[in-house]
């Protein structure tokens, strides 16, 4: 996260951070608790890393530095990534995970809420981004779990800050015209959140941006509400029932 | 399957036209930034142009400045390029090509993805 | 403009033996945006390497890149008898994009 500060124990139970354990151990990107068993993250982050038993998922955890072998952390037992997605281009970057077991929620692990699906009437304008990511382009992951307040962008400004991408509907934007604050590397997966009517929605999975806090250059994440069929077909079909924390 | 046909090459005149085309299956066409590349005889790939998804936005290289259009109907799933006051030096297989633009570690990623199979343009008198 | 020169202009290897081809760019370039093609006469490029190091679809594991900054190889750990064309390397940092001059990796 560029341009944001520390977060607090229980601001954002719902961030997780998936790590890679091959030789050494790593933050990749983040994620968001979205039922007991599910985490829901961008479909990118597994590109040339497919394998479920390298990943280590660490839900209830603001500091990376505080975690030591013996920190639990939950392992995959599947890796649902959208039928749609191609490793050639931006859209459908959101894929489910299956936790091997449960979590138990606590007050520093649990989960966000999802919007109703096809949420185009919503305003919002609290809306934030959190994340380990770096904290400039050419950074490093951060130890302190960072927040930042950025406003959503209509998609027709966002295609003209990205004329040689295409933004489609499923894609919503957040910037600062200046830049200064954005998501960045090590963000990717996790969660652009808004708070509307006291209750804190899932509205976007952070995906893509050029570079990091530039002027004009907002950053992209993958619209929820648009994928709600595909949320709920996937964790239905794979629990019997539903265990989503939808909107009250 | 992916697939890029481009035709229209041939053989023209100095300061002749030509109009090639490069029809697209197997993607959604309209959601990609297609270029073009040539590769005159015995030599290596030079890039010519490309133009984003929409058509709106176009760039060239300095050698074809001004004398080359690069265009495209996403109705049509059709990439053309529209070369005028062509010169002996643009003698070249052209080729089409698929931009792939991947996410990696939250950038974009930028790469020719598909390639057409060519077309031979000939500039001679 | 960026530059990209490679080396050697050719390679003469045996099948089974390792090829390492450099591509120096004259200025930096985001490895996103560094790519590796193979041609082999008369056909189009074929995409090997894309983001500096990651495989294309299809491409076997002894294809290999790496690299930053200014500094990219493409390692083929293992010649194969097809493995035997011209090698690329291209950028799109920053327009105009360029390619390299050319590898040729010939039959020893």
């Known amino acids: 996260i560029v341009g944001g500060t520390n977060s607090s124990w229980g601001e954002w139970p719902w961030q997780v951070s998936l790590q890679v354990k091959l030789t050494a151990q790593r933050h990749l990107c983040g994620g968001s608790l979205i039922g007991h068993q599910w985490v829901l993250t961008a479909a990118h982050c597994f590109d040339g890393l497919p394998l479920q038993d390298v990943w280590r998922i660490y839900s209830g955890i603001l500091n990376l530095s505080d975690i030591t072998k013996d920190t639990p952390f939950s392992q995959i037992k599947e890796i649902i990534i959208h039928q749609n997605y191609k490793v050639s281009e931006g859209n459908h970057d959101i894929a489910l995970i299956k936790l091997q077991a449960p979590l138990n929620y606590t007050e520093f692990q649990k989960p966000i809420c999802l919007p109703s699906k096809g949420d185009t009437s919503t305003i919002y304008t609290n809306c934030w981004v959190t994340g380990w990511g770096f904290s400039k382009e050419k950074g490093e992951i951060q130890n302190i779990l960072q927040k930042v307040n950025i406003p959503l962008v209509t998609n027709e400004e966002c295609q003209k800050r990205y004329q040689d991408y295409k933004i489609t509907q499923r894609m919503v934007c957040a910037g600062y015209k200046e830049g200064g604050k954005d998501a960045c590397k090590g963000d990717s997966g996790g969660p652009l959140v808004c708070k509307h009517n006291g209750m804190w929605r899932l509205v976007g999975i952070t995906s893509w941006g050029e570079g990091c806090a530039r002027r004009e250059q907002p950053g992209v994440y993958t619209k929820v509400a648009e994928y709600m069929d595909w949320i709920l077909e996937k964790t239905q079909s794979s629990d019997g029932k539903a265990q989503m924390q939808s909107p009250a | 399957e992916v697939q890029l046909l481009e035709s229209g090459g041939g053989l023209v005149q100095p300061g002749g036209s030509l109009r090639l085309s490069c029809a697209a299956s197997?993607?959604?066409?309209?959601?990609?930034?297609m270029t073009w590349v040539r590769q005159a005889p015995g030599k290596g790939l030079e890039w010519v142009s490309y133009?984003?998804?929409?058509?709106?936005?176009?760039i060239y290289a300095d050698s074809v400045k001004g004398r080359f259009t690069i265009s495209r109907d996403n109705s049509k799933n059709t990439l053309y390029l529209q070369m005028n006051s062509l010169r002996a030096e643009d003698t070249a297989v052209y080729y089409c090509?698929?931009?792939?633009?991947?996410?990696?570690?939250?950038?974009?990623?930028?790469?020719?993805?598909?390639w057409g199979q060519g077309t031979l343009v000939t500039v001679s008198s | 403009e960026i530059v990209l020169t490679q080396s050697p202009g050719t390679l003469s290897l045996s099948p089974g033996e390792r090829a390492t081809l450099s591509c120096r760019t004259s200025q930096f370039v985001n490895s996103n945006y560094l790519a590796w093609y193979q041609q082999k006469p008369g056909q189009a490029p074929r995409l090997l390497i894309y983001?500096?190091?990651s495989r294309a679809t299809g491409i076997p594991d002894r294809f290999s890149g790496s690299g930053s900054g200014t500094d990219f190889t493409l390692t083929i750990s293992r010649l194969e008898p097809e493995d035997f064309a011209v090698y690329y390397c291209q950028q799109s940092s920053r327009t105009p994009w360029t390619f390299g001059q050319g590898t040729k990796v010939e039959i020893k």
């Open positions: 090509a698929m931009v792939g633009q991947g996410i990696r570690g939250r950038s974009r990623t930028s790469y020719f993805a598909q």
């Open positions: 197997g993607f959604t066409f309209s959601h990609y930034l």
């Open positions: 133009i984003s998804p929409s058509g709106g936005h176009t």
């Open positions: 983001g500096a190091s």
